[in-house]
């Protein structure tokens, strides 16, 4: 009935409303400078200030600049919206040691577990890696009898520890001296390591071997079944696939039932020391000479104890490979040595924090 329809031009003469033909109802007219948050606003709260691009409307109704993720060590987690800032987080392979509003003030590379130890929890954008001793032949989850009754989610398949050259384990986040603690937020819960329930609670002389599966009816496929992250080698042994979890490595080919995962140096790096299915030592490309730091009084001594070099002693480059090659089992404290006449020298101690410079190259942060 025509008389039931609002008078289109004035909505019963109310100047603060207008008639929207598309939705066939009266809508609230947003005051000058404010914009509707929906197609047909009904009340003043449905109107808002319009901010410039890359600005958002904060709780106090002010247009505030969205944070920028333009630093090399940051990536965008959530975009800039009308009512919320862009959120940045540390890029993969790094964690936030000093948080900032909607961003991170300082990102450090994840720690690399020292040779012989295993990853308990891999690093995330918020948390660093946590390592622990390996558990030879016995599930690490059985700390009390009740823990051995059923699989626990934190168990990592055990194999002989592979020496890892921590040439890039420049990421341990505790300065060697001075005791400067990183913000405690750099250490609450991490994501769990991959489960491997079938290795729990039973010692195994063949790490990574699952109980042999019965042959499927009419099938000749009766091969030995290995645990996740293990492969069947030529000798018919279950062998741990190499891990590409080091910050300077990326996965080239995945871990398959009959072949190991293969790793290669991440873009911008070249392999200085090769290793089976991986690279023991990646160096930035192009290579530039690195300064090294040693305590002068220790120069003549064999048993040098390393200290974090003072701020400003580390150039924006990584060490050159020593004569191009180094043994894959280089010990953590010696893996970064530069070929020189001096006694032990350590450009980037494994326990000095390493951040990224504005050029994206690792730089030492002495705390």
């Amino acid at each position: 009935f025509p008389q039931d329809r609002p008078f289109e031009d004035t909505c019963h003469g109310n100047p603060s409303h207008y008639y929207d033909k598309a939705v066939r109802r009266c809508c609230y007219r947003c005051p000058m400078g404010l914009f509707p948050t929906q197609q047909c606003p009904q009340r003043p709260t449905d109107c808002r200030k319009q901010c410039e691009p890359d600005y958002y409307l904060d709780e106090a109704d002010r247009c505030t600049a969205c944070v920028t993720c333009s630093r090399d060590d940051l990536v965008e987690k959530t975009p800039c919206a009308w009512n919320s800032s862009r959120v940045c987080e540390c890029r993969p392979g790094m964690f936030c040691s000093t948080s900032a509003v909607n961003s991170c003030a300082r990102c450090f590379f994840h720690s690399v577990c020292p040779a012989g130890m295993i990853v308990k929890f891999p690093g995330t954008a918020q948390k660093n890696t946590v390592c622990e001793p390996a558990s030879p032949g016995v599930s690490p989850a059985c700390a009390s009898p009740e823990n051995c009754k059923e699989p626990s989610s934190g168990t990592i398949p055990q194999a002989k520890p592979t020496p890892v050259s921590p040439a890039t384990s420049s990421a341990s986040t505790m300065p060697v001296r001075g005791g400067t603690r990183l913000a405690q937020e750099a250490a609450s819960k991490l994501t769990r390591a991959p489960d491997s329930p079938s290795s729990v609670g039973r010692p195994s002389s063949d790490p990574g071997l699952s109980p042999t599966q019965p042959c499927p009816e009419g099938s000749g496929d009766c091969r030995k079944q290995c645990e996740p992250d293990y492969y069947l080698d030529e000798a018919g042994r279950c062998t741990a696939c190499v891990s590409c979890s080091r910050d300077d490595l990326v996965e080239k080919t995945p871990c398959a039932w009959n072949s190991s995962r293969t790793c290669e140096c991440r873009p911008g790096m070249i392999c200085a020391t090769s290793a089976t299915n991986s690279c023991a030592r990646c160096v930035p490309y192009p290579i530039c000479a690195a300064e090294t730091v040693t305590k002068p009084q220790d120069m003549a001594e064999k048993d040098t104890t390393f200290e974090a070099p003072p701020l400003g002693t580390q150039p924006d480059c990584n060490p050159t490979p020593e004569n191009g090659e180094a043994p894959a089992s280089t010990s953590p404290t010696q893996s970064l040595l530069v070929d020189s006449q001096a006694s032990k020298t350590l450009p980037i101690p494994t326990s000095a924090p390493v951040a990224l410079s504005s050029t994206g190259k690792p730089v030492l942060d002495a705390g």
Partner: antibody
């Protein structure tokens, strides 16, 4: 500052169950990477690691005592507990709880120790 | 279990001397070794971790070295307050194990 303090019964008879409590302050066991271990030391002898509890309630223990050991924690009250069943005179020792620090997350050593509580097992 | 052997139960020294305490692992533990100092009636205190890194606040006369199976703690200029027992610890694999200790005494 970080402090840890052990408490226990002092004296037990063989076959009884030992219950120890480690009360700590200055850190939280909810922080990732953090953990607390129990370590014992018979008088005039070396140190023996017994068990460890991680921030996420994951536990590890010494296989030589595993069947008798239970480690647990109460994060909100900043306490870690150790139970050893069927004690024997060989369990006579000073029992320490010690913290594995979170910020040395790629190492496994103990930066702060309690003063220890002495247990004597005697019939 | 990995056995950590500290062959010398006692070592005699004088103030100002340089002394080296040794520790041998029964198998390769890479550099996953810590050293502690324990004074009579006290609990152990960390000195060195990862075989050669000095723990925060530890005087620089304490140095650690070694990797694989042989480790050394060296005190370059022994002070009277250094007279204590020294323990090595491996954390390469569970169970974590300690050496039997070496007591540093005055000559």
């Amino acid at each position: 500052q970080v402090t840890l303090k052990e408490s226990g019964p002092g004296i037990l008879q063989p076959s009884q169950t030992l219950s120890l409590t480690c009360s700590f302050s200055g850190f939280s066991l909810s922080v990732s990477g953090m953990g607390v271990s129990w370590i014992r030391q018979p008088s005039g002898k070396g140190l023996e690691w017994l068990a460890h509890i991680h921030w996420d309630d994951d536990r590890r223990s010494n296989p030589s005592l595993r069947s008798r050991l239970t480690i647990s924690k109460d994060t909100s009250n900043n306490q870690v507990f150790l139970k050893i069943t069927s004690v024997d005179t060989a369990d006579t020792a000073t029992y320490y709880c010690a913290r594995r620090p979170d910020l040395y997350g790629n190492y496994f050593f103990f930066d702060f120790w309690g003063q220890g509580t002495t247990l004597t097992v005697s019939s | 279990d990995i056995v950590m052997t500290q062959s010398q139960k006692f070592m005699s020294t004088s103030v100002g001397d340089r002394v080296s305490v040794t520790c041998k692992a029964s198998q390769n533990v890479f550099t996953n070794v810590a050293w502690y100092q324990q004074k009579l009636g006290q609990s152990p205190k960390p000195l060195i971790y990862s075989a050669s890194y000095r723990y925060s606040g530890v005087p620089d006369r304490f140095t650690g070295s070694g990797s694989g199976t042989d480790f050394t703690l060296t005190i370059s200029d022994v002070q009277s307050e250094d007279l204590a027992e020294y323990f090595c610890q491996q954390y390469n694999s569970y169970p974590v194990t300690f050496g039997a200790g070496t007591k540093l005494e005055l000559k």
